[in-house]
């Protein structure tokens, strides 16, 4: 069972001093921040017992395994159901405490009732303040039964529940009709899932015989020991004032566990601490009684004395619960109450015994849960004891349960049961997760869900290049930390698997499923520099760059050009996808803008060093295009162009630019300036005969404007090849006059 205790401090004279504390003895309890331990939760449960709303209660965490609830302002704040939840995963457990008002009309004779399936449970509500009205019993807040007020027997109202079943479990209350719910007697009924002394699915397994008021858990067969007792069968008493599964916790305050109610996981419920009794756990046990709620009787023999915390204290020469066993009778010594082994291991188990006559090897045997008897393979005989060593065959899951070491001599016999837990080594259910990658390293999260049993003691990460037959590399890591696999090959796929281990021999689980993780490319190291750039228009920029010469192949997939517009806070990125490219045309830029320009080599997703930046000012946008451009051949070497001025000019035109290109030619176009902006006609001279030309033009004010439409015209035939076109302008009217 989960080591979880809910302590209620019952100093009821002052509700402000009342507190509830939930203490977990579980490893990693309450940390909450990691995957291995969810936090402890402690709260008032208002689903069944609803009380008037008050100020919110204060929750204080004391370290990782304790949480305390305070801030009760009036007695009614205390009445009701409180619960603490702790433990992880399938072991998550709720412990419940039910608080009754000491001033209620009806008070429970006993708050917690733990019964077996099929038993008859009897809840008894004692009359504290009589009313002459019906008594209504409720179960989990819903009507259950009515008693006439005359039906009180001996000042008590009894609710008999025959043949109870697990669904009958819950919170029961007895209330006088018309009385406040706060005046009710509240009970907790816990119905074990099995009949007396049985546990497990189908209730086929036998309980270990829990001592000192311990209760056998119907799911796992473990004894839930009363506060102040420990051991597989609760056979050992803790020192006064101690509690917890290993007696590791100490009651707060100078009066030890006085005034504290202890609630433990079902099916135990709640009781006073060992040595105390009464509704407020403030009364010491009467002589001859001991244990939680003083429910146990000592009945010491052979001069033993009764200690209210631990039971019989035997004089020299005697032992046993009632000091009924002579030390001449053989006795099993110091047997651990619980052992844990991993599946498929072959452990050695030792069992030591003493007595008179002295036990020998053959007189000590080990019995498994299925009844198989193992004989010891060797024995170590010492003056005061004989230790028998047993070699256990390969363990299977069915070996989990209660084993027994038994010693028999002519002086009598003794046996000691102990719990063996066969644990399944953990196996990852998922592959590890890739967090980040570089060219030579991978950062991996090894923490995955797993089947089998924790705790996880070590995590091994196995990795090797994909499709490789070479040995796996292995790294052992802390379970809660990310792992960096280093010194890997760039641009390489690696198969990565997790292996988890739990403590103990044979605790290594099978490897988890593989996953493919690929390292990044090598980083490009070459730094380009910008050779030059020129503006090809108000929104176009041609850029060229170079790379240093180095031996070997170029490490790179292409270039990234970056233009930063500082005014607008905008970045433009242009990808040039050939590593051989050394020039690029950037279009769609914003005219009149000051850009910072740089270039970087890239490889896969990695960028190399950027070139030193250049600063480029694009001219502002120019005027609209000239209209109605027309071309007319004049001779075998001359073509006249005519046009109309652009409309809606933002200012005076400074010049026109004519672009001349041989139709279908592969050469660069020729640009000719018309420096007299008032003209609307020009003659292009020096053309080749019988050649088809393309013409377009644009105006310039502060910057070049938009291109006009393109026109085609051919020179007349059979002239000699000219040296190249030139231009002569005049006003259109003048040309017409001629």
């Amino acid at each position: 069972a989960v080591d979880l205790t809910l302590l209620a401090n019952l100093r009821l004279t002052d509700p402000q001093r009342f507190f509830l504390t939930c203490v977990s003895g579980e490893a990693g309890a309450g940390r909450g921040s990691d995957a291995w331990g969810p936090p402890l939760l402690l709260e008032k449960d208002d689903r069944i017992v609803r009380t008037p709303p008050g100020p919110p209660l204060r929750l204080a965490r004391n370290g990782s395994h304790q949480v305390t609830l305070r801030g009760f302002s009036k007695p009614s704040d205390l009445v009701g159901v409180f619960s603490c939840v702790g433990g992880a995963g399938a072991r998550r457990t709720r412990v419940i405490y039910v608080h009754n008002s000491p001033g209620a009309h009806l008070l429970p004779d006993k708050v917690t009732h733990t019964v077996n399936k099929g038993d008859t449970a009897v809840l008894s509500a004692r009359v504290h303040k009589e009313k002459q009205t019906d008594v209504i019993w409720k179960s989990n807040g819903s009507y259950f039964y009515t008693l006439d007020w005359h039906e009180a027997q001996d000042g008590r109202f009894l609710l008999q529940l025959p043949n109870v079943q697990p669904p009958s479990s819950g919170i029961y209350s007895a209330t006088y009709l018309e009385a406040s719910p706060l005046g009710s007697a509240f009970f907790r009924l816990i119905v074990r899932g099995c009949g007396a002394g049985r546990w497990g699915p189908g209730c086929t397994k036998e309980c270990p015989g829990c001592l000192h008021g311990g209760v056998c858990h119907d799911h796992d067969g473990e004894c839930v020991c009363p506060p102040g007792f420990t051991g597989t069968r609760c056979e050992q008493a803790c020192r006064e004032g101690r509690f917890g599964q290993s007696c590791q916790e100490q009651c707060p305050g100078i009066s030890g566990c006085r005034g504290l109610t202890f609630c433990l996981p079902d099916p135990y419920g709640c009781s006073c601490g060992s040595g105390w009794r009464g509704s407020q756990c403030q009364e010491a046990c009467a002589p001859g009684h001991f244990g939680a709620d003083c429910r146990l009787q000592c009945q010491c023999q052979n001069g033993g004395t009764c200690d209210r915390f631990s039971g019989c204290v035997c004089p020299s020469g005697w032992h046993g619960v009632h000091c009924e066993k002579s030390d001449r009778i053989p006795q099993i010594l110091n047997m651990a109450s619980e052992l844990e082994f991993n599946l498929e291991t072959m452990p050695r188990i030792n069992c030591a015994a003493a007595g008179n006559p002295f036990p020998v090897r053959g007189s000590i045997e080990l019995r498994k849960p299925d009844g198989t008897v193992l004989l010891s393979t060797k024995a170590i005989v010492e003056p005061e004891k004989t230790t028998a060593e047993f070699e256990v065959p390969r363990l299977v899951l069915a070996d989990s349960g209660f084993w027994e070491c038994r010693v028999s001599t002519s002086g009598g016999q003794d046996s000691r049961r102990f719990k063996v837990n066969v644990k399944v080594p953990p196996v990852p259910l998922a592959a590890p997760r890739l967090l980040t990658k570089q060219s030579r390293q991978l950062v991996v999260s090894p923490l995955v869900s797993f089947s089998g049993d924790g705790p996880i003691s070590t995590v091994r990460l196995h990795y090797r290049p994909q499709d490789s037959t070479m040995d796996w590399s292995t790294i052992v890591v802390d379970p809660s930390e990310n792992v960096t696999l280093m010194n890997l090959r760039p641009k390489t796929g690696y198969s990565v698997r997790v292996q988890l281990s739990r403590p103990g021999e044979g605790g290594e689980g099978a490897w988890g499923p593989p996953t493919l993780m690929t390292t990044d490319c090598p980083e490009p190291l070459l730094q380009p520099w910008l050779e030059g750039w020129h503006v090809e228009g108000t929104d176009r920029l041609r850029v060229s760059w170079s790379l240093p010469l180095v031996p070997g192949p170029l490490v790179g997939d292409g270039f990234l050009l970056r233009l930063w517009d500082g005014t607008r806070g905008q970045e433009r990125r242009e990808n040039v996808s050939s590593p051989q490219a050394r020039t690029a045309l950037l279009t769609g830029l914003t005219p009149g803008t000051h850009y910072q320009l740089d270039v970087q080599l890239y490889h896969c997703t990695l960028l190399g060093p950027a070139s030193p930046p250049a600063h480029v000012l694009l001219p502002p946008s120019g005027p609209p295009a000239p209209r109605h451009l027309h071309a007319q051949a004049l001779s075998d070497s001359e073509i006249q162009l005519t046009w109309k001025h652009p409309e809606a000019l933002p200012g005076p035109i400074s010049k026109y630019v004519v672009e001349v290109q041989v139709a279908g030619g592969a050469g660069d176009p020729l640009w000719i300036d018309v420096d007299r902006p008032e003209e609307t006609s020009t003659i292009i001279r020096g053309l080749n005969a019988s050649t088809r030309y393309l013409f377009r033009m644009r105006a310039s004010i502060q910057g070049l404007g938009d291109w006009s439409n393109t026109v085609e015209e051919s020179t007349l035939g059979n002239g000699l090849q000219a040296e190249g076109p030139v231009q002569e302008s005049r006003a259109a009217e003048e040309g017409l006059d001629q």
Partner: antibody
Framework: EVQLLESGGGLVQPGGSLRLSCAAS????????MTWVRQAPGKGLEWVSS????????YYADSVKGRFTISRDNSKNTLYLQMNSLRAEDTAMYYC??????????WGQGTLVTVSS | QSELTQPASVSGSPGQSITISCTGT?????????VSWYQQHPGKAPKLMIY???KRPSGVSNRFSGSKSGNTASLTISGLQAEDEADYYC??????????FGTGTKVTVL
């Protein structure tokens, strides 16, 4: 669904006897206090008798004490009202009702008893 | 076991609030907070509207509320609706495990 169904009513002469039954379904009958309430034609409701779950405690209105007997059979989920020495003033619609908390939360549709010569 | 006294009739317009009184003695209404109220439509069985003085069963409109002062209990219907037209009866615990009903009030929605 919680249901109560009365039966056994009818015409009876003064001084005669009648036994009413109330069949319960849809709930754990043996856990509830049960009551008979009657309503004379055109008149108000009148509490007649109550019986506790165990059957050991029974109570009657003064007007019927000594003549009527309430009983129950928890194994048959049935409530009874044995009416002897009937009088004309016992003529009424007889309802059985289930009591939970402080009220009669579930009622049958009633059975009519007419005492007349 | 004398009956509790209720007004024979109470009327109100839709949307109005009305209050029905139920007067008993110090032996019944005055001693216990165990008054319940029932609504009965013609030809139908009664229906529990309020119990233990002021508690409403689930499914009953919050327009119905109960209160008590001294020997008199009251049922208030707010936001009167046509379907509220019915007979209403109070009932009180009278001690010694006996109960007593009221004379009944006819509620008319004008």
């Amino acid at each position: 669904e919680v249901q109560l169904l009365e039966s056994g009513g009818g015409l009876v002469q003064p001084g005669g006897s009648l036994r009413l039954s109330c069949a319960a379904s849809g709930f754990t009958f043996s856990n509830y206090k049960m009551t008979w309430v009657r309503q004379a034609p055109g008149k108000g409701l009148e509490w007649v008798s109550s019986i506790y779950p165990s059957g050991g405690w029974t109570y009657y209105a003064d007007s019927v004490k000594g003549r009527f007997t309430i009983s129950r059979d928890n194994s048959k989920n049935t409530l009874y009202l044995q009416m002897n020495s009937l009088r004309a003033e016992d003529t009424a619609m007889y309802y059985c009702a289930r009591q939970e908390d402080g009220g009669y939360g579930t009622w049958g549709q009633g059975t009519l008893v007419t005492v007349s010569s | 076991q004398s009956e509790l006294t209720q007004p024979a009739s109470v009327s109100g317009s839709p949307g109005q609030s009305i209050t029905i009184s139920c007067t008993g003695t110090s032996s019944d209404v005055g001693s216990y907070n165990l008054v319940s109220w029932y609504q009965q439509h013609p030809g139908k069985a009664p229906k529990l509207m309020i119990y233990e003085g002021s508690k409403r069963p689930s499914g009953v409109s919050n327009r119905f509320s109960g209160s008590k002062s001294g020997n008199t209990a009251s049922l208030t219907i707010s936001g009167l609706q046509a379907e509220d037209e019915a007979d209403y009866y109070c009932c009180s615990y009278a001690g010694s495990s006996t109960y007593v009903f009221g004379t009944g009030t006819k509620v008319t929605v004008l």
